[in-house]
């Protein structure tokens, strides 16, 4: 069951997302709770995802997400990543919230989630260049698979934003 509803950002009365798509969750007591994502966002588990069609630098992509009260995608599980891959276009690359600011191969997620080398999804022979400090998801034809690739942060790419579901 879905419905649309205005969301007011309570602190500033600023309308950030004017339309939500909500799913009713059955609660143990008489109350009804709604779990919502902004219109045109994808819903998976406890998060909402926005897949951009415009290209921008990593820095501007991060700000574009912030303007929507979100952040660049932080990948926590294989399942989450597989869901994202299903919604991407194979001919494009998409910035995620992983970067190496100093070029020392010290990878950092934008939300401070610890970088775990054992649960990464780099393409073979990636990361390849310490001057490529930002990460994209892209599709390679041989072998046919999605994965991570390091790229120059100033090169424009599409991106994926993530936010927690809104509960009403």
């Amino acid at each position: 069951q879905k419905y649309s509803q205005l969301l007011e950002k309570k602190t500033t009365k600023e309308l950030v997302h004017t339309t939500l798509e909500c799913v009713k969750k059955n609660m143990p007591v008489e109350e009804t709770a709604w779990s919502c994502c902004p219109k045109n966002w994808k819903s998976f588990s406890s998060n909402c995802y926005f897949i951009s069609t415009e290209s921008a630098s990593w820095q501007d992509s991060e700000k574009d997400c912030a303007r929507m009260e979100a952040h660049l995608l932080v990948i926590n599980t294989q399942e989450e990543q597989d869901f994202i891959f299903q919604n991407l276009q194979e001919e494009s690359a998409y910035f995620v919230g992983l970067s190496d600011p100093e070029g020392q191969r010290h990878w950092q997620w934008v939300d401070q989630t610890p970088y775990n080398e054992s649960s990464t999804f780099w393409h073979p022979r990636e990361p390849s260049d310490p001057n490529e400090r930002c990460v994209v998801l892209n599709f390679r034809k041989s072998p046919k698979r999605w994965g991570w690739n390091d790229v120059n942060c100033l090169g424009p790419q599409r991106s994926v934003c993530e936010m927690m579901k809104i509960h009403l």
Partner: antibody, heavy 119, light 107 residues
């Protein structure tokens, strides 16, 4: 260490053209945007715009569109600011400044190039 | 465009005093704000970024604070080398405008 070294002072007449250089060293040039800032005598700082050093794409603030042009010589890690058809009000010190990796704030600055336009 | 209103335009203080400079923005810039110090005849130097993070090598008597549209730079126990001009600048959306500046003079 990281350095931005600018070309020397310029004295020009109205209508002439000037080209100011900013040579970067101590870091990978194409990883950081290069900004230009104007400071007229006794006045505050005005952002002129920046160049994406990876794509070469310039961005100009509206007030500086038309006569101002940014360019790059990537192999020499050098950025340029050219001002055409100089006017008296272009008299100022021009700074280049590196844009930080993530947030764009200006973490390193050149020493400034003083441009005087006078007939 | 985001407008930056910096105050005061000038300020006289003595060594050892504490001063505060403020910067008000016309829209929420979500802490995308930097503070710079500029001495006479020199290039500006980064003091604070992301509204409250001190740049490398900046003494701890400097401190940035604020959020939304209101930001401040506080200098505790002023030292002789602290006198000069101070500017705020936002990085939320282009153009990345500067505040008008604050001239900090010795009383």
């Amino acid at each position: 260490q990281i350095q931005l070294v600018q070309s020397g002072p310029e004295l020009k007449k109205p209508g002439e053209t000037v080209k100011i250089s900013c040579k970067a060293s101590g870091y990978t040039f194409t990883n950081y945007g290069m900004n230009w800032v104007k400071q007229a005598p006794g006045k505050g700082l005005k952002w002129v715009g920046w160049t994406n050093t990876f794509t070469g794409e310039p961005t100009y603030v509206d007030d500086f569109k038309g006569r101002f042009a940014f360019s790059l010589e990537t192999s020499a890690s050098t950025a340029y600011l050219q001002i055409n058809n100089l006017k008296n009000e272009d008299t100022a010190t021009y700074f280049c400044a590196r844009g930080n990796f993530r947030y764009y704030y200006f973490d390193y600055w050149g020493q400034g190039t003083t441009l005087t336009v006078s007939s | 465009d985001i407008q930056m209103t910096q105050s005061p335009a000038s300020l006289s203080a003595s060594v050892g005093e504490t001063v505060t400079i403020t910067c008000r923005t016309s829209g929420n810039i979500r802490n995308y704000l930097a503070w710079y110090q500029q001495k006479q005849g020199k290039s500006p130097q980064l003091l604070v970024y992301n509204a409250k993070t001190l740049a490398d090598g900046v003494p701890s008597r400097f401190g940035g604070s604020g959020s939304g549209t209101q930001y401040s730079l506080k200098i505790n126990s002023l030292q002789p080398e602290d006198f000069g001009n101070y500017y705020c600048q936002h990085f939320w959306s282009s153009p990345y405008t500067f505040g008008g500046g604050t001239k900090l003079e010795i009383k």
